[in-house]
């Protein structure tokens, strides 16, 4: 078989206090960094970012939660609880662009969902969300 | 419609499955007005540690 798989975006959103600006390599700014692509759902958790201007992305600084394989890294073996959440958005239509983190539709929906979760779980214990995946309802 | 699946991370001991689901359900009305997202069929479950992101998603389809 040809080709290499790529991961659905694993974005850690976090209400961080210190922030830094970074320049994105692509001319069109993307509100979420596109992950290193080598599995269907990589466990790398990146920082939440919001669009600022045409060439930069604003990131909240977060604790490093990364893993080089399909299991969570050892430093997370205690102190963190994970929950799988699934829900339907009935007023949106799925289309194939929701399978690709570089599309506008994917990025807009992911940004809205990420912001929504920051609003819902404002208490101190919330670390973020990751492994977001969209599929038809 | 669009089905959204994701993993939430919390500091251990700060929340349980029931509270994750309750808080999310309580926000559904605001989500509709603020983000124009009409949310339904919410399902929350514990992810056993350590977990595989891939098998975890697969088991919940």
């Amino acid at each position: 078989a040809s080709g290499s798989a790529s991961g659905s975006a694993s974005t850690l959103v976090h209400n961080g206090t210190s922030a830094r600006a970074t320049t994105t390599p692509a001319s069109k700014s993307t509100p979420f960094s596109i992950p290193s692509h080598h599995s269907d759902t990589p466990t790398t958790l990146a920082s939440h970012s919001t669009k600022t201007d045409a060439s930069s992305t604003h990131h909240s600084s977060v604790p490093p939660l990364t893993s080089s394989n399909h299991s969570t890294s050892p430093q997370l073996s205690t102190g963190v609880s994970f929950f799988f959440l699934s829900f339907h958005i009935s007023n949106l239509q799925f289309n194939s662009s929701l399978e690709d983190p570089s599309t506008d539709y994917y990025q807009e929906l992911q940004r809205d969902i990420s912001e929504m979760f920051l609003q819902i779980y404002k208490q101190g214990g919330f670390l973020g969300l990751s492994n977001i995946k969209f599929r038809p309802g | 419609s669009v089905v959204v699946q994701l993993t939430l991370a919390f500091r251990e001991g700060t929340i349980n499955v029931h509270d994750v689901e309750t808080q999310f359900n309580q926000y559904k009305t605001e989500a509709a007005s603020r983000y124009n997202l009409t949310i339904s069929d919410v399902s929350v479950s514990d992810v056993p540690f350590p977990f595989s992101a891939q098998s975890h998603h697969h088991h919940h389809h």
Epitope: A5, S27, H37, T103 | Q54
Partner: antibody, heavy 117, light 107 residues
Framework: EVQLVQSGAEVKKPGASVKVSCKAS????????INWVRQRPGQGLEWIGY????????EYNEKFKGRVTLTSDTSASTAYMELSSLRSEDTAVYYC??????????WGQGTLVTVSS | DIQLTQSPSSLSASVGDRVTITCRAS??????LNWLQQEPGGAIKRLIY???SLDSGVPKRFSGSRSGSDYTLTISSLQPEDFATYYC?????????FGGGTKVEIK
């Protein structure tokens, strides 16, 4: 390693139908999309349509609407592309390409469909 | 439909040469462009996704970039196995469309 294995070459008469299969192996992950693309002899690539495995969600290129049907069998991790009312200009190699976190990540080896009377 | 104008349609080069292939999009497609390699036998492999991200297992001599509506695939030092046909593919909007292809031949 992910593999997409397509069915073998077909020879069909004008007016007939052909059904090409695309079986995914390597990952048991069953939620992803499959795009179908064709390449006529000596020509470039042309997008036919898309199906999300395990659902009835499809997208079609207007050019093929009404003649092409995309289906899938989740239990067999297989996608199918059926093209009806075949004509000589449908002679082409038909490719499937699956998503894996992004579109067109893996490609099948291609299936040659020859339409000849 | 979005048109992708790919140039050149063919080129002759030697091993070690730097090769540049360009695709121009008729509409704004952001970074939603892939580069594909088709071997002489017909096998297709994705090299670059999202304009500039290298697929795993693809040699680092391949790179992708963008300037406005122009998208470029660069092979920094051509190797014998790189003699093939290259296509760009946009997935910004349906129907997804391909460039006309660039055949890279041995000089």
């Amino acid at each position: 390693e992910v593999q997409l294995v397509q069915s073998g070459a077909e020879v069909k008469k004008p007016g007939a139908s052909v059904k090409v299969s695309c079986k995914a192996s390597g990952y048991t992950f069953t939620s992803y999309g499959i795009n179908w693309v064709r390449q006529r002899p000596g020509q470039g690539l042309e997008w036919i349509g898309y199906i999300y495995l395990g659902s009835d969600y499809t997208e079609y290129n207007e050019k093929f609407k009404g003649r092409v049907t995309l289906t899938s069998d989740t239990s067999a991790s297989t996608a199918y592309m059926e093209l009806s009312s075949l004509r000589s200009e449908d002679t082409a190699v038909y490719y499937c390409a699956r998503s894996a976190g992004s579109l067109f990540a893996y490609w099948g080896q291609g299936t040659l469909v020859t339409v000849s009377s | 439909d979005i048109q992708l104008t790919q140039s050149p349609s063919s080129l002759s080069a030697s091993v070690g040469d730097r090769v540049t292939i360009t695709c121009r999009a008729s509409q704004d497609i952001g970074i939603t462009l892939n580069w594909l390699q088709q071997e002489p036998g017909g096998a297709i492999k994705r090299l670059i996704y999202a304009t500039s991200s290298l697929d795993s297992g693809v040699p680092k001599r391949f790179s992708g970039s963008r300037s406005g509506s122009d998208y470029t695939l660069t092979i920094s030092s051509l190797q014998p196995e790189d003699f093939a046909t290259y296509y760009c593919l946009q997935y910004a909007s349906s129907p997804y469309t391909f460039g006309g292809g660039t055949k890279v031949e041995i000089k």
